[in-house]
């Protein structure tokens, strides 16, 4: 994987990232919502990409809790039976069916806040989440297709004469790798059982005036560029070139 580098600014140019636990929410400010929600769509579905290891808050339709009869969260995760979390206002009781993940909870007491939270989102939280609100005016739904995003681990190394390998390991979805300058490249994808994908791009540069090569990894969680200085092949006879 190349020689040990003097500092972080040569072989593995790792972008500095903030790993603090972030929270994301698609909840709207209820003051901005039309009072009469029935004039809006009665059912809203949203695709929502969420970064792994962050916190997520999912919201019900903006219906005043005083008008409520029942709130139900329906959670459909891959390979698991459907989980439901229900709250009946009249009796002030909550009920859960087939819900085993302790990280998926009501944000607070459902009589105060109908939102659902996922603490420290994991790959297993990929799925469909739907809030169903039963009111005297009818049923209102809001659904989320939650797509958990996993930042790939990026490495770059030279493995043969003027050939470099860039890997974006275990990303979700698959990362896209491009090079500066463009080389003669082959890209392979490896799919893992947990839904992540490793992308490996191997490039060769025949032209000898290429000094450094940059691997640019594009991903929904953010982009990263690494570069290395191409080294002569070990054991090769010395040469002198003009540029």
């Amino acid at each position: 994987e190349g020689a040990a580098q003097p500092n972080n600014s040569l072989m593995l140019q790792t972008s500095k990232e903030n790993h603090a636990l972030a929270s994301s929410s698609l909840c709207m400010d209820e003051k901005q919502i039309t009072q009469n929600y029935s004039k809006v769509l009665a059912e809203v579905n949203t695709s929502w990409p969420v970064k792994m290891a962050t916190n997520a808050v999912l919201c019900c339709p903006p219906i005043a809790l005083r008008n409520l009869i029942i709130i139900t969260w329906e959670i459909i995760l891959r390979g698991q039976p459907s989980c439901t979390k229900a709250y009946k206002k009249e009796t002030n009781e909550t009920k859960e069916t087939n819900c085993t993940d302790e990280r998926i909870t009501w944000v607070s007491r459902p009589d105060q806040n109908s939102d659902l939270q996922i603490r420290t989102v994991a790959i297993t939280h990929d799925g469909y989440y739907r809030c169903i609100m039963v009111t005297p005016d009818g049923n209102f739904h809001r659904g989320y297709h939650l797509q958990v995003l996993v930042t790939p681990e990026v490495t770059l190394f030279q493995n043969r004469n003027r050939t470099a390998v860039c890997k974006a390991v275990a990303g979700k979805p698959a990362a896209h790798i491009s090079w500066i300058p463009e080389g003669d490249c082959a890209t392979k994808q490896e799919y893992w059982s947990n839904g992540t994908v490793t992308v490996k791009s191997t490039c060769h540069w025949e032209v000898h005036n290429v000094s450094t090569v940059t691997c640019h990894v594009s991903h929904l969680t953010g982009n990263k560029s690494l570069y290395i200085e191409l080294l002569p092949v070990p054991g090769a006879k010395k040469s002198a070139k003009l540029y």
């Epitope: 003097p6 000094s211 570069y227 080294l231 002569p232």
Partner: antibody, heavy 114, light 105 residues
Framework: EVQLQQSGTVLARPGASVKMSCEAS????????MHWVKQSPGQGLEWVGA????????NYNQKFKGKAKLTAVTSASTAYMELSSLTNEDSAVYYC???????WGQGTLVTVSA | DVQMIQSPSSLSASLGDKVTMTCQAS????LNWFQQKPGKAPKLLIY???NLEDGVPPRFSGSGYGTDFTLTISSLEDEDMATYFC?????????FGGGTKLEIK
């Protein structure tokens, strides 16, 4: 800690040759290209060439063909640049640098004067 | 050779100002940004277009891709008075921008 220590100021006559050194420490000397950069008074920076101490491969800027010669002694972790047939145009500060500009020597001032 | 056009060649700004300078390359490249003070060697600020070198204040940032690149100082400080260079290291010969001399008003 990575350090590049360059030899001191040189005063030379036109037509003469000078050889300056760059001693490296704090990293594996044979694993990185060592580049040399020229900075003339009040001017920008110009790449002279580079040497890979691991096998003494060299790359030169066409402009410095026949002017600069790069060598390295791995046992001393030291790179050298020799400038020949000096003229006033060669008066400048010369830097050695490695790891794609991460580390620089303090520079060697060469003054060519009759 | 890759031509590097750096602009402006000089600029004067007040303390606290946001300052930007640009480098334009004749080919698609990757670059580093350096700061140089009189009588001193260049100091690496930004590597690989946008990565802040260890120990460099976060008021410095780099951006761009391909042929157009920018160095930004978000809030100018006294110690930032220097000349700034870009370097393209993708192709040999390496080529530098002409430099931007930054002065404090």
């Amino acid at each position: 800690e990575v350090q590049l220590q360059q030899s001191g100021t040189v005063l030379a006559r036109p037509g003469a040759s000078v050889k300056m050194s760059c001693e490296a420490s704090g990293y594996t000397f044979t694993s990185y290209w060592m580049h040399w950069v020229k900075q003339s008074p009040g001017q920008g920076l110009e790449w002279v060439g580079a040497i890979y101490p691991g096998n003494s491969d060299t790359n030169y800027n066409q402009k410095f063909k026949g002017k600069a010669k790069l060598t390295a002694v791995t046992s001393a972790s030291t790179a050298y640049m020799e400038l020949s047939s000096l003229t006033n145009e060669d008066s400048a500060v010369y830097y050695c640098t490695t790891a794609v500009g991460s580390y620089w020597g303090q520079g060697t001032l060469v003054t060519v004067s009759a | 050779d890759v031509q590097m056009i750096q602009s402006p060649s000089s600029l004067s700004a007040s303390l606290g100002d946001k300052v930007t300078m640009t480098c334009q390359a004749s080919h698609t490249i990757n670059l580093n940004w350096f700061q140089q003070k009189p009588g001193k060697a260049p100091k690496l600020l930004i590597y690989g277009t946008s990565n802040l070198e260890d120990g460099v204040p976060p008021r410095f940032s780099g951006s761009g891709y391909g042929t157009d690149f920018t160095l930004t100082i978000s809030s100018l400080e006294d110690e930032d008075m220097a000349t700034y260079f870009c370097l393209q290291h993708t192709y040999l010969p390496w080529t530098f921008g002409g430099g931007t001399k930054l002065e404090i008003k």
